[in-house]
Amino acid sequence: QSPPGKPEIHKCRSPDKETFTCWWNPGSDGGLPTNYSLTYSKEGEKNTYECPDYKTSGPNSCFFSKQYTSIWKIYIITVNATNEMGSSTSDPLYVDVTYIVEPEPPRNLTLEVKQLKDKKTYLWVKWLPPTITDVKTGWFTMEYEIRLKSEEADEWEIHFTGHQTQFKVFDLYPGQKYLVQTRCKPDHGYWSRWGQEKSIEIPNDFTLKD
């Protein structure tokens, strides 16, 4: 039996700059029941506060709701582990909410096979930004990637589309079924997970409809 090992705050993420969660790895418990508490202060402030919500984001986590989230201030966060033999504290982590955004994936993915005047066919992929991000006001500048592969293929083909919410894919094989997904990343943050998969078959004998 011994004091607890040093915990580590290993990840903080925000879906929208309005709320965020930090998770920690507990470290060893020294063979004893161990309590964990997350405390934080904000830049320029002397006061220290305890985590407002240990439940919402699951075990070993702290959720900061809108009421507790500010993008104007740096959060200085530590986790303390305590058992009857002693305590230990994580290294402090400095968190700027601007830099931890991992948005939801883009939505409303639509796939359409089109044809140019020269009879060349292409797949027109369109999507919308995630619901919660106010892209129009410039609050978020979002970049996108799409990936696609034929059902038989092992490897995805990835296309970076910049700020565009549509993309044309050429040189696809007629008669093949293709799977497509999109993801997005804010200017300073992390890529979202890949969104819902959509599929479309490229016709063998595509003719332009009026």
């Epitope: 580590e8 830049e43 993008i71 982590l93 601007t98």
Partner: antibody, heavy 118, light 112 residues
Framework: QVQLQQPGAELVRPGTSVKLSCKAS????????MHWVKQRPGQGLEWIGV????????NYNQKFKGKATLTVNTSSSTAYMHLSSLTSEDSAVYYC???????????WGQGTLVTVSA | DVVMTQTPFSLPVSLGDQASISCRSS???????????LHWYLQKPGQSPKLLIY???NRFSGVPDRFSGSGSGTDFTLKISRVEAEDLELYFC?????????FGGGTKLEIK
């Protein structure tokens, strides 16, 4: 505690390339971006670029595109920077540096001195 | 790229005096999120830089309160209220509002 270990020095020939390493320990490697910074002897600091170890996404200073390539090996918690077509202008100390979830450098490696000489 | 101009290049001081280092940026360092990402680092010979001040005026963990930062927009200052022997080192300002992040040329604090 957080540590970033870099070899002390590399002596290389002009026109060749070198791969610098930065072994991270004391934290979850894939959770924090890794930056690289150049310092020529007696001069200021230049930001080369950054890599997100969780998915190898990179962002380079335009000046170093084509010169530096950043990669990671997550299984060994090591970040790498490959420098190509070396000239005397590339002789410098190269640091790896980690921020927290912020845009400044909280932790630095000790730096690797690269000397390009015939 | 944002050019960071530090003055003076070298600053002779007496121990116990106040030292003041200036840093000017070629464009405003106010980020679209309202924050100003101007930081100060200290570097000792043969060592890597260490963070002193982040976001203009916030002392990093363990930094003595004789160090203070101020300024806004494009003009910033690092002040050391009572210079001690261990402060006679190289100081850099740095901006991370705009990519690429850039640094000042450095100011060497030395004994008068």
């Amino acid at each position: 505690q957080v540590q970033l270990q870099q070899p002390g020095a590399e002596l290389v020939r002009p026109g060749t390339s070198v791969k610098l390493s930065c072994k991270a320990s004391g934290y979850t490697f894939t959770s924090f971006w890794m930056h690289w910074v150049k310092q020529r002897p007696g001069q200021g600091l230049e930001w080369i670029g950054v890599i997100d170890p969780s998915d190898s996404h990179t962002n380079y200073n335009q000046k170093f595109k084509g010169k530096a390539t950043l990669t990671v090996n997550t299984s060994s918690s090591t970040a790498y920077m490959h420098l190509s077509s070396l000239t005397s202008e590339d002789s410098a100390v190269y640091y790896c540096a980690r921020g927290d979830y912020s845009n400044w450098f909280t932790y630095w490696g000790q730096g690797t001195l690269v000397t390009v000489s015939a | 790229d944002v050019v960071m101009t530090q003055t003076p290049f070298s600053l002779p001081v007496s121990l116990g005096d106040q030292a003041s280092i200036s840093c000017r940026s070629s464009q405003s360092l106010v980020h679209s999120n309202g924050n100003t990402y101007l930081h100060w680092y200290l570097q000792k010979p043969g060592q890597s830089p260490k963070l002193l001040i982040y976001k203009v005026s916030n002392r990093f963990s363990g930094v003595p309160d004789r160090f203070s930062g101020s300024g806004s927009g494009t003009d910033f200052t690092l002040k050391i209220s009572r210079v001690e022997a261990e402060d006679l080192e190289l100081y850099f300002c740095s901006q991370s509002t705009h990519v690429p992040w850039t640094f000042g040329g450095g100011t060497k604090l030395e004994i008068k």
